[in-house]
C-alpha cells in the first residue's frame, strides 16, 4: 500500500484499528463534469445486446435508487435486427460501494457495503463444453 | 422520499441539516456470495467490443484502485474475426460513489464523491447525422 | 458541432483516376476516423475506405482494395481518397464520414460518374 502523510489539520479519530469508523461528508462532489449523458443513454436499446434497466430501490441503502440491467435476448440482434442464438448476450457486472444505515434506520451511523450490479449487457461468443 | 423511522439507539449526530457528517464503519460487508467471478472475467475478450482495462490508483481515495474500460477498437469484431466498422464499440458507464479524503492526507475524514467509469464494451449501431 | 467539407467528384472514364479530400473541423476525439462511404440510389450505402484519427489503421471494402487509397493530413484533419482504376461500377455519391463511437456524420456527398 501507498503510505499517506497525515495532514496535521486532521480530525481526532478514537479509534485507530480496523474496523474503523470514519466521518464522511455527505456533500457529493461530482467530478463528471466534461460528460455528456445524453450520448449513452439510448445505448441499451442501440446495442446488439440490448437490455432493460429495471429500478432497485432501498431505503436502507445510500444511494437508496440503483438500477440494474437485465439482457433482453439470450442470443444477440443480427444486422437483420434478428436474435442470433449463435451468439450470446451477458451482464457486465461490477462491484459499487454503497451505504448501509447500520443500525438499521439510523441517519447518521452507515456501514460500507459492496454489491454487485449489472451495468449493461455485452455480445460474447459462448464457450462450448463437450459434456458426458 | 421515503420516511425511514427513527431507531432510537442510533449514535448522536451533532448536525442534523445537510450538508451532513455522518459516521461510516470501513468494514466492508460483502453481499456478492452468490457470484462467480470466473464466469464474467474473460467477457472483456470474448466479446465484439473487446476492452482492455486500465488500472486508475489515486491513494487520496477509497476504493484506492479503480479499473477502467477502453473499447479496443471503434468498430466491432464481426464472425469472421475482424473489424466491422459499420458497428461500433462504445463504453457502457456507471455513476459510482467513491470516499474522498478531506482534508487531503486524512485517514479517517472522507467526503463522498460521485465518479463516472467506464465498466466494459457494448456493439452499437451508429446514428447517422447528415451535417452541412 | 461537426462540420464535413468534401471535394474532388466529376465525370472520369473507366480506368481513370480522381482524388476526393474532405475536411473535418469540430470535436474529435482520439477514438474516432473519417472516410468514405458510397450510395447508389436503391442500393444499400457500402463503407468504401475509412482510417483512425489516432492509429492510423486503415479499411477497404473488397471491391476497392489495391485500387483506392485513403490517407489523412493530421494538421487540418483531411482526409484523401486516391482513386485509381476506376470502373462503371464505381460510379455512386460518395460521402465523406466522421465516425466518432457511436455517432457517424456524412457529409453532402460529391457525385463520382465512370463511363465506359
Known amino acids: 500500500g501507498i503510505t499517506i502523510p497525515r495532514n496535521p489539520g486532521c480530525p481526532n479519530s478514537e479509534d485507530k484499528n480496523f474496523p474503523r469508523t470514519v466521518m464522511v461528508n455527505l456533500n457529493i462532489h461530482n467530478r463528471n463534469t466534461n460528460t455528456n449523458p445524453k450520448r449513452s443513454s439510448d445505448y441499451y436499446n442501440r446495442s446488439t445486446s440490448p437490455w432493460n434497466l429495471h429500478r432497485n430501490e432501498d431505503p436502507e441503502r445510500y444511494p437508496s435508487v440503483i438500477w440494474e440491467a437485465k439482457c433482453r435476448h439470450l442470443g444477440c440482434i443480427n444486422a437483420d435486427g434478428n436474435v442470433d442464438y449463435h451468439m450470446n448476450s451477458v451482464p457486465i457486472q461490477q462491484e459499487i460501494l454503497v451505504l448501509r444505515r447500520e443500525p438499521p434506520h439510523c441517519p447518521n451511523s452507515f456501514r460500507l457495503e459492496k454489491i454487485l450490479v449489472s451495468v449493461g449487457c455485452t455480445c460474447v461468443t459462448p464457450i462450448v463444453h463437450h459434456v458426458a | 422520499g421515503i420516511t425511514i423511522p427513527r431507531n432510537p439507539g442510533c449514535p448522536n449526530s451533532e448536525d442534523k441539516n445537510f450538508p451532513r457528517t455522518v459516521m461510516v464503519n470501513l468494514n466492508i460487508h460483502n453481499r456478492n456470495t452468490n457470484t462467480n467471478p470466473k464466469r464474467s472475467s474473460d467477457y472483456y475478450n470474448r466479446s465484439t467490443s473487446p476492452w482492455n482495462l486500465h488500472r486508475n490508483e489515486d491513494p487520496e481515495r477509497y476504493p484506492s484502485v479503480i479499473w477502467e474500460a477502453k473499447c479496443r477498437h471503434l468498430g466491432c469484431i464481426n464472425a469472421d474475426g475482424n473489424v466491422d466498422y459499420h458497428m461500433n464499440s462504445v463504453p457502457i458507464q456507471q455513476e459510482i460513489l467513491v470516499l474522498r479524503r478531506e482534508p487531503p492526507h486524512c485517514p479517517n475524514s472522507f467526503r463522498l464523491e460521485k465518479i463516472l467509469v467506464s465498466v466494459g464494451c457494448t456493439c452499437v449501431t451508429p446514428i447517422v447525422h447528415h451535417v452541412a | 458541432q461537426v462540420q464535413l467539407v468534401e471535394s474532388g467528384g466529376g465525370l472520369v472514364r473507366t480506368g481513370g483516376s480522381l482524388r476526393l479530400s474532405c475536411s473535418v473541423s469540430g470535436d474529435i476525439s482520439s477514438q474516432s476516423a473519417m472516410g468514405w462511404y458510397r450510395q447508389v440510389p436503391g442500393r444499400q450505402r457500402e463503407l468504401v475506405a475509412m482510417?483512425?484519427?489516432?492509429?492510423?489503421?486503415?479499411y477497404y471494402a473488397d471491391s476497392v482494395k489495391g485500387r483506392f487509397t485513403i490517407s489523412r493530413i493530421n494538421a487540418n484533419n483531411t482526409i484523401y481518397l486516391q482513386m485509381n482504376n476506376l470502373k462503371p461500377e464505381d460510379t455512386a455519391i460518395y460521402y465523406c464520414?466522421?465516425?466518432?463511437?457511436?455517432?457517424?456524420?456524412m457529409g453532402q456527398g460529391t457525385q463520382v460518374t465512370v463511363s465506359s
Open positions: 482510417i483512425h484519427t489516432t492509429k492510423g489503421d486503415t
Open positions: 464520414t466522421h465516425n466518432e463511437p457511436g455517432d457517424l456524420y
